[in-house]
Amino acid sequence: ATKAVCVLKGDGPVQGIINFEQKESNGPVKVWGSIKGLTEGLHGFHVHEFGDNTAGCTSAGPHFNPLSRKHGGPKDEERHVGDLRNVTADKDGVADVSIEDSVISLSGDHCIIGRTLVVHEKADDLGKGGNEESTKTGNAGSRLACGVIGIAQ
């Protein structure tokens, strides 16, 4: 199995640790962990193109999109590789993350290692909104916290 980890940090109170595990090279990736300091509700959760956090989360670039597709939900065929879904924070601001995704990978063309995981200010509308931005970012708003996804032992 291949494992990876990401430590999420931002300018504000949002922080977390997210783990990744892929048992087979073409199999699904399990994503789990916890994020705290969020406002209650849904928050966009995406893998962005670059593993560059030199200017904070903004330097991570757009969603990881090697197939040049439109933004969408995790179950959509038309989605960015990095479109993981929303995470849900409870009234205490904690989001317990438990995802299984078959599009991201920890190896090959869809490998997310060395790229940036971002949790956003607002809910992702999953490409269903009425403006162009919906088809790019899901209108998920600013980047609250991020971290580079690294290989774990």
Epitope: G41, A123, D125, K128
Partner: antibody, heavy 116, light 107 residues
Framework: EVQLVESGGGLVQPGGSLRLSCAAS????????MSWVRQAPGKGLEWVAN????????DYVDSVKGRFTISRDNAKNSLYLQMNSLRAEDTAVYYC?????????WGQGTLVTVSS | VIWMTQSPSLLSASTGDRVTISCRMS??????LAWYQQKPGKAPEVLIY???TLQSGVPSRFSGSGSGTDFTLTISCLQSEDFATYYC?????????FGQGTKLEIK
């Protein structure tokens, strides 16, 4: 400039059928979910139906399920609403709008009147 | 179904006034809220989506705020073209529902 132009409205008897059309221009129609929203005379807004950009998913408000069918032809940049078994309470201006859950540009609307 | 209570239903104000319109949900809707403006005989136009994001071309005197179940549309300095009917809409949960509307009229 984004333009949505509805057509096909009119007077129909209860139990009758109508097919509404919406011609889209000024944007990449095949990239967007689309919706129909209606407004009864002097009343508020009611979302009716939506359809995914590739036509593979549709949703309907309960009051029209089994009677209305939303469809699209991306080659013609057109959205449709087939309305069967029409009732008096379906009387409204029907708007087509870009987006499946919240709505950007809207058309000017087409009036459907169901009356005997 | 998420029930929405928009208030007031009628609001009388003068040019230059600051006005607020409230929209309350029967359950939390995260940031899945939009506001629309409709003038008589015209189609609605989106003003704000995702609670507070201003649609391109909408004047900055319009703003949206709130979270969870309580949301507000504010017009900071009313202009003559702002007298219209305003609707909130939730898109958190199917079916996507609109508030009953607030008619903003000249005092």
């Amino acid at each position: 400039e984004v333009q949505l132009v509805e057509s096909g409205g009119g007077l129909v008897q209860p139990g009758g059928s109508l097919r509404l059309s919406c011609a889209a221009s000024g944007f990449t129609f095949s990239s967007f979910w689309m919706s129909w929203v209606r407004q009864a005379p002097g009343k508020g807004l009611e979302w009716v139906a939506n359809i995914k950009h590739d036509g593979s998913e549709q949703d309907y408000v309960d009051s029209v399920k089994g009677r209305f069918t939303i469809s699209r032809d991306n080659a013609k940049n057109s959205l449709y609403l087939q309305m069967n078994s029409l009732r008096a309470e379906d009387t409204a201006v029907y708007y087509c709008a870009r987006g499946g859950i919240w709505f950007g540009p809207w058309g000017q609307g087409t009036l459907v009147t169901v009356s005997s | 179904v998420i029930w929405m209570t928009q208030s007031p239903s009628l609001l009388s104000a003068s040019t230059g006034d600051r006005v607020t319109i409230s929209c309350r949900m029967s359950q939390g809707i995260s940031s899945y809220l939009a506001w629309y403006q409709q003038k008589p005989g015209k189609a609605p136009e989106v003003l704000i989506y995702a609670v507070s994001t201003l649609q391109s071309g909408v004047p900055s005197r319009f703003s949206g705020s709130g979270s969870g179940t309580d949301f507000t549309l504010t017009i900071s300095c009313l202009q003559s073209e702002d007298f219209a009917t305003y609707y909130c809409q939730q898109y958190y949960s199917f079916p996507y529902t609109f508030g009953q509307g607030t008619k903003l009229e000249i005092k």
